[in-house]
Amino acid sequence: AFGISGVPKYTRALHDSSITGISPITESLASLSTYNDQSITFALEDESYEIYVEDLKKDKKKDKVLLSYYESQHPSSESGDGVDGKMLMVTLSPTKDFWLQANNKEHSVELHKCEKPLPDQAFFVLHNRSFNCVSFECKTDPGVFIGVKDNHLALIKVDYSENLGSENILFKLSE
């Protein structure tokens, strides 16, 4: 079934998303909103998908995203046994066969149809910034996060020496 925006919405059955023999350790369906409670929505326009950050009308249902969680070894793990090195990475898919991807050259976040295995640009390191806010760091470009810029998603460089709590890279996940 297609929603108002023209993006086929997930039903209860989560689609298969194993990659290169690695399965996600868990999956969840959630709507994504900004720190300021604007919704992240997805629309089909001219045969390509656009991502918007907008205030939702009361009667409009929030778009759901399938988050698939993967374990990964941290590249800077000091110990060879993996004790220090576990991170959680996620992929975000608002519709079957399409995933959010980082375009590091354009500093943009795009929705692309992908063949498996998924490219590294589709993986984001998960950060819990607070009790109910998360951030998504590019696997391919540490220190660069999905953020909000001019009512669109963009890639934003964060200086680790500063407080990482800047609101434009904070998102809320809700069922």
């Epitope: 350790i25 868990t26 969840s28 969680y69 374990e71 941290h74 800077s76 000091e78 110990s79 004790v83 220090d84 090195g85 576990k86 991170m87 959680l88 390191v125 998960l126 950060h127 819990n128 910034r129 607070s130 009790f131 109910n132 407080n163 990482l164 709590g165 069922e175």
Partner: antibody, heavy 121, light 106 residues
Framework: EVQLVESGGGLVQPGGSLRLSCAAS????????MYWVRQAPGKGLEWVAA????????YYPESVKGRFTISRDNAKNSLYLQMNSLRAEDTAVYYC??????????????WGQGTLVTVSS | DIQMTQSPSSLSASVGDRVTITCKAS??????LDWYQQKPGKAPKLLIY???NLQTGVPSRFSGSGSGTDFTLTISSLQPEDFATYYC????????FGGGTKVEIK
């Protein structure tokens, strides 16, 4: 090897204060959520405090809110729990615990051996 | 606050038995649930995370299942070293432990 060593427990009178410490080693302390969990004698586990990697946010259950304060010193790889206005029901073994993953608040992957706090007159 | 109700609070079993412990959340917690094992005088140890993922080094006789509000820990064939207390723990909204299940020798 991940190590968490608690200290600072002991006997304190009701209304008194105590500061617990947890010395961490064997991992990148500044990248992990950290927690305090307690266990009263013969009872179950109770989460009592949590703190984000950069110490920007801290969280408590209603049972200790306003009396306990969690803090951390990433330069010293140390976690603390300041306990004020202690009550008899705060008597417990207090465990320091580390998040399972870098950066996330999911799961308590490693635990210290605990330090006993006894509140009694 | 989310409440976690664990049952039974205690059970007696023999070596080789299949043991099942359940945990019920007061509201949907997705799969944000762990199981911990604690032996007398020792710190708890993470057994299973995100409902069904075995922590490194944990024997495959332990398994977890469930989603939403109902969760299960199963020990397929109880071994002498498995006599302990088991706790469920949710981290979907805040952090809450279940009351514990003591597995004793019959």
């Amino acid at each position: 090897e991940v190590q968490l060593v608690e200290s600072g427990g002991g006997l304190v009178q009701p209304g008194g204060s105590l500061r617990l410490s947890c010395a961490a080693s064997g991992f990148t302390f500044s990248s992990y959520w950290m927690y305090w969990v307690r266990q009263a004698p013969g009872k179950g586990l109770e989460w009592v405090a949590a703190i984000t990697p950069n110490a920007g946010e801290d969280y408590y259950p209603e049972s200790v809110k306003g009396r306990f304060t969690i803090s951390r010193d990433n330069a010293k790889n140390s976690l603390y729990l300041q306990m004020n206005s202690l009550r008899a029901e705060d008597t417990a073994v207090y465990y320091c615990a580390r998040g399972h993953y870098y950066y996330t608040s999911y799961s308590l992957g490693y635990w210290g051996q605990g330090t006993l706090v006894t509140v009694s007159s | 606050d989310i409440q976690m109700t664990q049952s039974p609070s205690s059970l007696s079993a023999s070596v080789g038995d299949r043991v099942t412990i359940t945990c019920k959340a007061s509201q949907n917690i997705n799969k944000h649930l762990d199981w911990y094992q604690q032996k007398p005088g020792k710190a708890p140890k993470l057994l299973i995370y995100f409902t069904n993922n075995l922590q490194t080094g944990v024997p495959s006789r332990f398994s977890g299942s469930g989603s939403g509000t109902d969760f299960t820990l199963t020990i397929s064939s109880l071994q002498p070293e498995d006599f302990a207390t088991y706790y469920c723990f949710q981290y979907n909204q805040g952090w809450t432990f279940g009351g514990g299940t003591k597995v004793e020798i019959k």
